[in-house]
Amino acid sequence: KSSNEATNITPKHNMKAFLDELKAENIKKFLYNFTQIPHLAGTEQNFQLAKQIQSQWKEFGLDSVELAHYDVLLSYPNKTHPNYISIINEDGNEIFNTSLFEPPPPGYENVSDIVPPFSAFSPQGMPEGDLVYVNYARTEDFFKLERDMKINCSGKIVIARYGKVFRGNKVKNAQLAGAKGVILYSDPADYFAPGVKSYPDGWNLPGGGVQRGNILNLNGAGDPLTPGYPANEYAYRRGIAEAVGLPSIPVHPIGYYDAQKLLEKMGGSAPPDSSWRGSLKVPYNVGPGFTGNFSTQKVKMHIHSTNEVTRIYNVIGTLRGAVEPDRYVILGGHRDSWVFGGIDPQSGAAVVHEIVRSFGTLKKEGWRPRRTILFASWDAEEFGLLGSTEWAEENSRLLQERGVAYINADSSIEGNYTLRVDCTPLMYSLVHNLTKELKSPDEGFEGKSLYESWTKKSPSPEFSGMPRISKLGSGNDFEVFFQRLGIASGRARYTKNWETNKFSGYPLYHSVYETYELVEKFYDPMFKYHLTVAQVRGGMVFELANSIVLPFDCRDYAVVLRKYADKIYSISMKHPQEMKTYSVSFDSLFSAVKNFTEIASKFSERLQDFDKSNPIVLRMMNDQLMFLERAFIDPLGLPDRPFYRHVIYAPSSHNKYAGESFPGIYDALFDIESKVDPSKAWGEVKRQIYVAAFTVQAAAETLSEVA
C-alpha cells in the first residue's frame, strides 16, 4: 500500500477536513469547563480533571488514554500559619503587614481552595534586616549595584520587581549576592498598561493582585529529588539537602499596594538611572535601609511553606499511526494551574481538547495519521515542568529513537495582536507554509492570510517579507524534549504588540484574576484567536504526522548556524588582545558551518529527487531528518547543566525563559574580563569552540549520503 492508501484520503483533503472540524464555540465551552475551580498540582481537583480529560479523550476516539502518575516534590503554604512580610520598629513591633490573600474576583467569593500568593519551594524562615531595591534582580542589576554603586547585599533583604527574566534567576542572583531574603513584587510599569482599567473592569493588574510562581533553578532536572530518572514507585530519592535547584533563602511575592509601603521609605542611594524606576510614586532609592526618621525600622519576612512529596497525574492519549506507528508526533500542554488558569494553562488545554476532538472525528470516519500522534495533558508544570519531565525520563529510550516532533500547547494567548512562534529552524518552512494557508483573524486583514498579518505586525529582523520566529528557551514543557532529548520542537500562541506594551507577560499572569471572564470579556470574546492558534498547533501536528516526507528543511538550520557563529564571534572580538594572546580561533566553527551548509544543500536536492514509492529509502531519508535535531545533543551536557544537552540552543544562564545560541561558548565568554585566571577562562572558551565545531560537523555528517 502507498502511504496515501493507508490513510484513506488525500493529504490535502485530510488537512482541510481536520481544520474545518475545529470550532471556536467548542474551545470556549471547554475553557469554561476547565476554569470554574482551581486545579493546583497535587490536589484532588486536578486529579478529577485528569480523569475527566481521560474519559473525554476516549469518547473523542483516541485508541488509548492512560494516566501516568509520579510522586514528586511540590510546595504549599501552611494553611494555619500564613506567609507575610512586615515592617518592624526598633522594639520589634509589626507596624505594617502585607496582605494574606488577593481580594477574590466578583463571582468567585465563595470558591474554596484558592492558594494564597506564595513563592513555591521557598524555604521556611523569618529573616529581618535592611531592604535593598535591586530593580529586576538580573545579573546586570547586581553588577551595577556591586561594581558601580558599591552596595553590598550581604545580609540584606532584597526587593525586586517581577519581569524581564524568570523569577528563579532573580532568586539565584540574590543568593549569590549574599541576600538573606527576597521580596518579589509587580510594578505597574511592567504589569499595568496605560489606558486600560484593572480587573474586573479591564485586563490590568489591581494593586492587590499578586503573581505566584516557582523559584527553582532546576536546569532541566525535573523532580528535584530524582534528577535524570522517573519519580516512580521504586525511585531512590535524594535527601532535601541534596535536592536539585531549591532556593536557600526565603522568598515571597506581593502586589504593588504593599510594595508601595515598603519602597516609599527607602533611603540610601538614588537609583542609578531611569531604567531602575517603575511607575509607583516612590523615589526608587536603592537603600540599603529606610531613610531618615524610618532608619531604625526593619523588614521582616514570615515564611512557613512546606515541601511535600505528592502524586501528580499526566494524561497520555494515543492515536496510532497507520504506516509508521513507531514514529511519534507529540502535542502536549499542561493542565495544572495556580488558581483558575483562565489563560495559563486552560486557554491552551481547551485548544488541545478541541484538536483531539477533531482528530477523533476523522478517525471515527476511518482515517488514521501516517505516524502515531501522542497527546499529553501534563501535571505540575507550574512547579518546574515536572509532569512532562518525569514522563520523558520514564520514556526516554522510546522518545530518542521514535520522537519526530513535539508541539507545545500552554497558554494560547498572551495578547490579541499577532502570532508568536518559537521553534527549531527545522520547522520554519512548515510554519511559513501552514500560515500562508490559514486565514488571519486580525481586524483589517479580512480575506488575508495569517502569514500576511503576522509578517506585517511582527517582521523578521533579518529577512524582509518574512515573520519573526524566535529561538526556543525554556519555562515550558517542551524543555525536556528539545533541550535534553533533541526532539524537534515548536510552540505558537497569540501575543501582544511588544512595541507598544512594554509590560512583562500579561498583567494578570498567575494571579487569582486569571479567570474565564478575563478571556471572554477582554482578550478574545469571539474565541477567534484561540481558533487560529488551534489551527496553527493542530495544523503543525497534522503535517508532522501525515506528510510523506517530514516537513523539515535542514537548509534553514544552516542559515541560523552561520548567523549564530557570526554573533558569538563578534562577542569574542570585543577582546581582540586576549584572543591574540591565547590564540583563540573560530576557524574550526566557521569551517563546520560551511560544511553543514554544503551537505544540507545536497541533502535537500536528494530529497526532491528520490523515489518516494520506495518505503526503505523514504524511511531512510525521513530518519536523517528526524535524527538531525538529535545530532546536536552532546551526551555530556553543558558545563554544570547536565540536562541541557543541545549544543546550539539552551535556556540563557541569566534568564530561563530566553534561548541562547552556542550557549557553551556564550557562557565561557560572559564577563570574562572579570575572571581571576584569564588563561583558564580563555582555555574554556577554546574548549567550547571545539565542542561546538565538532558537534556541527558531526550533525552535518548525519545528512551525508549513507554510503
Epitope: 540610601g268 542609578p272 531611569s274 523615589p283 531613610t291
Partner: antibody
C-alpha cells in the same frame, strides 16, 4: 587597560553648540552608565546628566533645561555630550565619568571656552 | 535640589597634622555621600563612598564619617601629597550635587 579618552579643547561662540566625545576602552561599555560632570574655573563640580549605554536612555540635570543631549555609539564604544545655546558661563572643563551615583573613573577632561 | 555646603572653604595645615573637613546637606541623605580629591590640573579621584568606606588604593590616613545631614572627612596625619581640593557629593537624590570644595594647603 581601562581608559576614557575625551576629545580635544574647543572654542565656541555664544549661541553655538559643542559636542564632546568620550571613547571608552578596556571594559564592557554597555555595562556601566556614563555621566557628564563639568567644572567652571574656580567653581564646584556640577553633574549634568547620565546615559545608560545599554538602552541609550538619559537622565538630565533640569538646570540645563533641554540644552544638553547625551548619546552613545555602542559599536564605537563612545559617549557624546552636546550642549547647545552656549553662553559665556558654560566655559568649563567637561568630564565624562563612568559609574552609577559614584564616579570612580574619569576622562581627562575637555576644556570648552565660550567667547565672542 | 540638595545643597552640599563644605567648611572651611580653604585651610592650611602642617605635615603630620590631623585635618577635618565637614560637609552639610540641606536635607537628609542617609549615608549616600562620597568624597573626592582633586589635585591641581588633575581629574577628581574617588576617596570615600557610603560616607565611610575607603575606595580601593586610598591610604588608611583618609577616613569618613557621618549620616543624615552632617559628614566629615578626616586626614589623620597630613602628607605633602595631600595638597588638593576636596569635594563631597551626595547621591541620595537627583540631581547629584557636589560641595563647593575645600582647598587644602601645607603651611
Amino acid at each position: 587597560e581601562f581608559q576614557l579618552v575625551q576629545s580635544g579643547a574647543e572654542v565656541k561662540k555664544p549661541g553655538a553648540s559643542v559636542k564632546v566625545s568620550c571613547k571608552a576602552s578596556g571594559y564592557s561599555f554597555t555595562d556601566h552608565n556614563m555621566n557628564w560632570v563639568r567644572q567652571a574655573p574656580g567653581q564646584r563640580l556640577e553633574w549634568m546628566g547620565l546615559i545608560n549605554p545599554n538602552y541609550g536612555t538619559a537622565d538630565y540635570n533640569q538646570k540645563f533645561k533641554g540644552r544638553v543631549t547625551l548619546t552613545v555609539d555602542q559599536s564605537a564604544t563612545t559617549a557624546y555630550m552636546e550642549l547647545s545655546s552656549l553662553r559665556s558661563e558654560d566655559t568649563a572643563v567637561y568630564y565624562c565619568a563612568r559609574g552609577s551615583s559614584l564616579f570612580a573613573y574619569w576622562g581627562q577632561g575637555t576644556l570648552v571656552t565660550v567667547s565672542s | 535640589d540638595i545643597q552640599m555646603t563644605q567648611s572651611p572653604s580653604s585651610l592650611s595645615a602642617s605635615v603630620g597634622d590631623r585635618v577635618t573637613i565637614t560637609c552639610k546637606a540641606s536635607q537628609g541623605v542617609d549615608t549616600a555621600v562620597a568624597w573626592y580629591q582633586q589635585k591641581p590640573g588633575k581629574v577628581p579621584k574617588l576617596l570615600i563612598y557610603w560616607a565611610s568606606t575607603r575606595h580601593t588604593g586610598v591610604p588608611s590616613r583618609f577616613s569618613g564619617s557621618g549620616s543624615g545631614t552632617d559628614f566629615t572627612l578626616t586626614i589623620s596625619s597630613l602628607q605633602p601629597e595631600d595638597v588638593a581640593t576636596y569635594y563631597c557629593q551626595q547621591y541620595s537624590r537627583y540631581p547629584l550635587t557636589f560641595g563647593q570644595g575645600t582647598k587644602l594647603e601645607i603651611k
